[in-house]
Amino acid sequence: MAVTACQGLGFVVSLIGIAGIIAATCMDQWSTQDLYNNPVTAVFNYQGLWRSCVRESSGFTECRGYFTLLGLPAMLQAVRALMIVGIVLGAIGLLVSIFALKCIRIGSMEDSAKANMTLTSGIMFIVSGLCAIAGVSVFANMLVTNFWMSTANMYTGMGGMVQTVQTRYTFGAALFVGWVAGGLTLIGGVMMCIACRGLAPEETNYKAVSYHASGHSVAYKPGGFKASTGFGSNTKNKKIYDGGARTEDEVQSYPSKHDYV
């Protein structure tokens, strides 16, 4: 029962995590204009992995896609790749884990097959979560680097003609969504791996029965019966340590069409 619960919970947690990874990847608020010095602004800029947006004081929002592929920073391409890999692995993991669920009967699938599928999906969720966390962390690192660079050099010349105040960007909501979602997927994957250990079929080993003929009497010596659960060695007293996903305390909200910042 505990195994089924662990597997089911792992599946649900991973499902929420992967939904979060997809949401984060699609969100436009990966980086948002830093409003530290000016909390009220007439023009608010924010950027995602796929497009950049500007919201004016009236609430009018205009988004422009990154139509170039070669002109984009390598780091942004790497983040995109990590997030997509995370989504693909997570989606495959979900598909595999559906068939691996103990509560779902599919033909005459053996427990050993379900155990293997559970382990496979668990590993996929772990890798998927790690990809998302890595992608978000790379982007966050990129933001921090650019933030301090633009702080040190607040004014940059545009073609040597126009002095323009460089817009500084800080962490957007998508980063926090991504970190939490990656963490959930990772935890879900670990839970699937734990559940896998309890799903392995029980090995029933009968010792050879020996018959000894001594006269007319037949001596029957029954062998001991040993059941072991898990793969190979005994699994008693093994502890699994998993780190929880850390999130920032601050919450950012974004106004609607009718808002201005």
Epitope: A42, Y46, G59
Partner: antibody
């Protein structure tokens, strides 16, 4: 057609308050930001603040903070601007204007103006 | 606050001639996020409220004659009246629409020579 009709001229004593109204028609009132701009005689225009009619959220110019209050009445599609602790330098024509929504924060429609005279 | 400085303060031009008004801002009005300039031009005739002519530095408001055109980027902007008409006699203002507080130039009075 879009119309912004302001209340009539006012004469006030220093230290008093004035409340100017701006009744709008011809468009969806809550969809557009409303601004207040004043102009002293022979002088340039001076932005006082904005109000978002949907939320009633305001942004005031630092110069007027604490003295100006902008409010809306959604039932009559009217915006109000109240200026307190009036001084002689507050004598000006007060305009309400509508933000053009997709016009890069420009003001596309203006009221006819309300002359406020502060005199002892 | 962004300071908007217009030049000249007044301008006398013959009918049918070109009138050029300059506006300089103390900070850039160019927004890198959408590659747009946040500057507007208004026309104000005596006893009337201002009328929007140009927004986004160069986009003409609907109904505005095409003899009015705006140009410039960053900190330097220009309003041009290609062929001055009698009805163009007015005071013209530029406005910073990029940052709060919104600020206006001191105005340029256009007259007929």
């Amino acid at each position: 057609q879009v119309q912004l009709v302001q209340s009539g001229a006012e004469v006030k004593k220093p230290g008093a308050s004035v409340k100017v109204s701006c009744k709008t028609s011809g468009y969806s009132f809550t969809d557009y930001l409303m601004l207040w701009v004043r102009q002293a005689h022979g002088q340039s225009l001076e932005w006082m603040g904005n109000i978002n009619p949907y939320y009633g959220r305001t942004t005031y110019a630092l110069k007027f903070k604490g003295r100006v209050t902008m409010t809306v009445d959604r039932s009559t599609s009217t915006v109000y601007m109240e200026l307190s602790s009036l001084r002689s330098e507050d004598t000006a024509v007060y305009y309400c204007a509508r933000d053009g929504y997709s016009l890069r924060n420009a003001m596309d429609y203006w009221g006819q103006g309300t002359l406020v005279t502060v005199s002892s | 606050d962004i300071v908007m400085t217009q030049s000249p303060d007044s301008l006398a031009v013959s009918l049918g001639e070109r009138a050029t008004i300059n506006c300089k801002s103390s900070q850039s009005l160019f927004n890198s996020g959408n590659q747009k300039n946040y500057l507007a031009w208004y026309q104000q005739k005596p006893g009337q409220p201002p009328k929007l002519l140009i927004y986004g530095a160069s986009t003409r408001e609907s109904g505005v004659p095409d003899r009015f055109s705006g140009s410039g980027s960053g900190t330097d902007f220009t309003l041009t009246i290609s062929s001055l008409q009698a009805e163009d006699v007015a005071v013209y203002y530029c406005q910073n629409a990029h940052s709060y507080p919104y600020t206006f130039g001191q105005g340029t009075k256009v007259e007929i020579k």
